[in-house]
C-alpha cells in the first residue's frame, strides 16, 4: 500500500549538537526499516547526510541528527523518503526552532535564615550562545497535596533559587523540578529535569529552635524518609 505522512515533521534543535525531528505516519510503521530522513546544510560543499528514524509510538517516528555548533544562518534541507518515494520535503532553521537542553543535577541544600537553596547546572558550556540566554522555571509541589504547588521564574543569571522554609508546609515532603528556555531565541521550554525530593522541616520562630537544630532534625527526618522509601 501507499505510504503517507499524517503529521509532517516538526523539528527542534538544542543549538549545540543535536536536532530532533518527529512526525506521524497514517498507519503503524516500522520507522527504521521503512523510512529515511536525509538532511543537508544549505552551504557550499555540504554533503547529504542520512538519519535512520526510530519508533516513538506505533505510527510516530523520531530522528536525532548530529549538527555542528549551530549558528543563526544555518538552514537545512530535509527530505523524508520511503525507499525511492519522496514523502515530504522541507527546510529547517535550528536558530528559529530551539528547544534547550534539560538543566541537570538539581539539588536541595539547607541554607542560612531558614531557607532552602535549590541549585542546578546550566546545560550549556560557557562558550555556547545559549549559556547566558537561559531563564528557568522551577516547579515545587507537595507530594501529598496536589493543590500545594508553587511555580518560580528564575530570570537572573545564576542557576539557583532560595526558598523560605516558612512558605512550605512543615513536615511535608516536597519535590522540585526545573526547565529552561531561551527568550532571545523565542525557544520552546526544555523538558523538565528529574525531580528531587526533600522533607521540609520548619518550626515557627516562637519555638526558638536554633537553625542548626532545625537542620539536624531535617537531616534525621530526611534519612528516615529515604530509608522508608527504600524498604517499601
Amino acid at each position: 500500500g501507499s505510504v503517507k505522512v499524517l503529521h509532517e515533521p516538526s523539528c527542534f534543535s538544542d543549538y549545540i549538537s543535536t536536532s530532533v525531528c518527529q512526525w506521524k505516519m497514517d498507519h503503524p510503521t516500522n520507522c527504521s526499516a521503512e523510512l529515511r530522513l536525509s538532511y543537508q546544510l544549505d552551504f557550499m560543499g555540504s554533503e547529504n547526510h542520512t538519519c535512520v528514524p526510530e519508533n516513538r509510538e506505533d505510527s510516530v517516528c523520531v530522528c536525532s541528527m548530529p549538527i555542528d555548533d549551530a549558528v543563526e544562518a544555518d538552514v537545512y534541507q530535509l527530505d523524508l523518503w520511503a525507499g525511492q518515494q519522496l514523502l515530504w520535503s522541507g527546510s529547517f532553521q535550528p536558530s528559529k526552532h530551539v528547544k534547550p537542553r534539560t538543566p541537570g543535577n538539581l539539588t536541595v541544600h539547607p541554607n542560612i535564615s531558614h531557607t532552602w537553596l535549590l541549585m542546578w547546572t546550566n546545560p550549556y558550556p560557557t562558550e555556547n550562545h545559549l549559556h547566558s540566554e537561559l531563564t528557568y522555571m522551577v516547579n515545587v509541589s507537595n507530594d501529598n497535596d496536589p493543590e500545594d504547588f508553587k511555580v518560580y521564574n528564575v530570570t537572573y543569571m545564576g542557576p539557583t533559587l532560595r526558598l523560605a522554609a516558612s512558605t512550605l508546609k512543615s513536615g511535608a515532603s516536597y519535590s522540585a523540578r526545573v526547565r529552561a528556555w531561551a527568550q532571545t531565541y523565542n525557544s520552546t521550554w526544555s523538558d523538565w529535569s528529574p525531580s528531587t525530593t526533600w522533607l521540609n522541616y520548619y518550626e515557627p520562630w516562637e519555638q526558638h529552635l536554633g537553625l542548626n537544630d532545625i537542620f539536624e532534625a531535617q537531616k534525621i527526618e530526611w534519612h528516615e524518609h529515604h530509608h522508608h522509601h527504600h524498604h517499601h
Partner: antibody
Framework: EVQLVESGGDLVKPGGSLRLSCVAS????????MTWVRQAPGKGLQWLSL????????YYADAVKGRFTISRDNAKNTLYLQMNSLRAEDTAVYYC??????????????????WGQGTLVTVSS | DIVMTQTPLSLSVSPGETASISCRSS???????????LDWYMQKPGQSPQGLIY???KRASGVSDRFSGSGSGADFTLKISRVEADDAGVYYC?????????FGQGTKLEIK
C-alpha cells in the same frame, strides 16, 4: 607532505575536448572538496568549479557551465576536469587546489590551502 | 554573482614600510560572527598562488605574522607590515561563501 600534480594540458583546436587530471597525496583526499582555478596568460585568477569530498555536490562558474564537468575518483585520489567545446578564451594555466573539509556537517573552511603546479591548455587552430 | 573589487590595482612600497590592500564584495561574506569567508592569496611570477589568510583574519600555516587580515561584511583589508623584497608579487582576495566563488582583479605589489 601534501602534493597535487596536474596533467593533461595540451594544444587543442577550438571545439575540441581535453581531460585534465590532478593526482593528490599526503592528505585524506575523500574528506576534502577540490577546486579548479585557471589563469589566462597575463591575467588574474578565475574560479571554475568545486566538487565535494564524496563527489555528490558540484558547482560551476557560468563561463564553463554545460561545457566542463568536474569529477573525482576517491579510490585513485584523483580529480578530473573534462573540458568540451573548447574555445580560444579557455587558453590558460589550469590549477587544482584543496578546498574545504566536507566530511563535517558544516564544511570547515581553510581557503584554498594547497595548489598544484598547473598545467597549460592552449586552444588554437 | 558576487563581484570582488580590489584597490589599488598596483602598489609601490619601500622595504620596512606597511602595505595595505583593500577588497570589497558586492554582498556580505559574513556567515556568522567570526566566520567571514574572505581569503587572501599571493602569487609570484611563474609560480602557483599560495594562501596567506582565510576566514578574513586567520593566517595560513607557515605564513609570517607580518601578514594580517581584517574586516567583516563586505569590506576587508590585507596589511603587510615591515615589507621585504620577497613580498613582491600579485595579491588576490577571494570570496569562499557563495557559488560561484570569485577572485578580485589582483593587486601588484612592487618593492622600491
Amino acid at each position: 607532505e601534501v602534493q597535487l600534480v596536474e596533467s593533461g594540458g595540451d594544444l587543442v583546436k577550438p571545439g575540441g575536448s581535453l581531460r585534465l587530471s590532478c593526482v593528490a597525496s599526503g592528505f585524506p583526499f575523500r574528506d576534502y572538496a577540490m577546486t579548479w582555478v585557471r589563469q589566462a596568460p597575463g591575467k588574474g585568477l578565475q574560479w571554475l568549479s568545486l566538487i565535494s569530498g564524496s563527489g555528490g555536490k558540484t558547482y560551476y562558474a557560468d563561463a564553463v557551465k554545460g561545457r566542463f564537468t568536474i569529477s573525482r575518483d576517491n579510490a585513485k585520489n584523483t580529480l578530473y576536469l573534462q573540458m568540451n567545446s573548447l574555445r580560444a578564451e579557455d587558453t590558460a594555466v589550469y590549477y587544482c587546489a584543496v578546498d574545504r573539509l566536507t566530511k563535517t556537517i558544516r564544511p570547515q573552511y581553510y581557503g584554498l590551502w594547497h595548489w598544484g603546479q598547473g598545467t597549460l591548455v592552449t586552444v588554437s587552430s | 554573482d558576487i563581484v570582488m573589487t580590489q584597490t589599488p590595482l598596483s602598489l609601490s612600497v619601500s622595504p620596512g614600510e606597511t602595505a595595505s590592500i583593500s577588497c570589497r564584495s558586492s554582498q556580505s561574506l559574513t556567515y556568522s560572527i567570526g566566520y567571514n569567508y574572505l581569503d587572501w592569496y599571493m602569487q609570484k611570477p611563474g609560480q602557483s598562488p599560495q594562501g596567506l589568510i582565510y576566514l578574513g583574519s586567520k593566517r595560513a600555516s607557515g605564513v609570517s605574522d607580518r601578514f594580517s587580515g581584517s574586516g567583516s561584511g563586505a569590506d576587508f583589508t590585507l596589511k603587510i607590515s615591515r615589507v621585504e623584497a620577497d613580498d613582491a608579487g600579485v595579491y588576490y582576495c577571494m570570496q569562499g561563501l557563495h557559488s560561484p566563488l570569485g577572485f578580485g582583479q589582483g593587486t601588484k605589489l612592487e618593492i622600491k
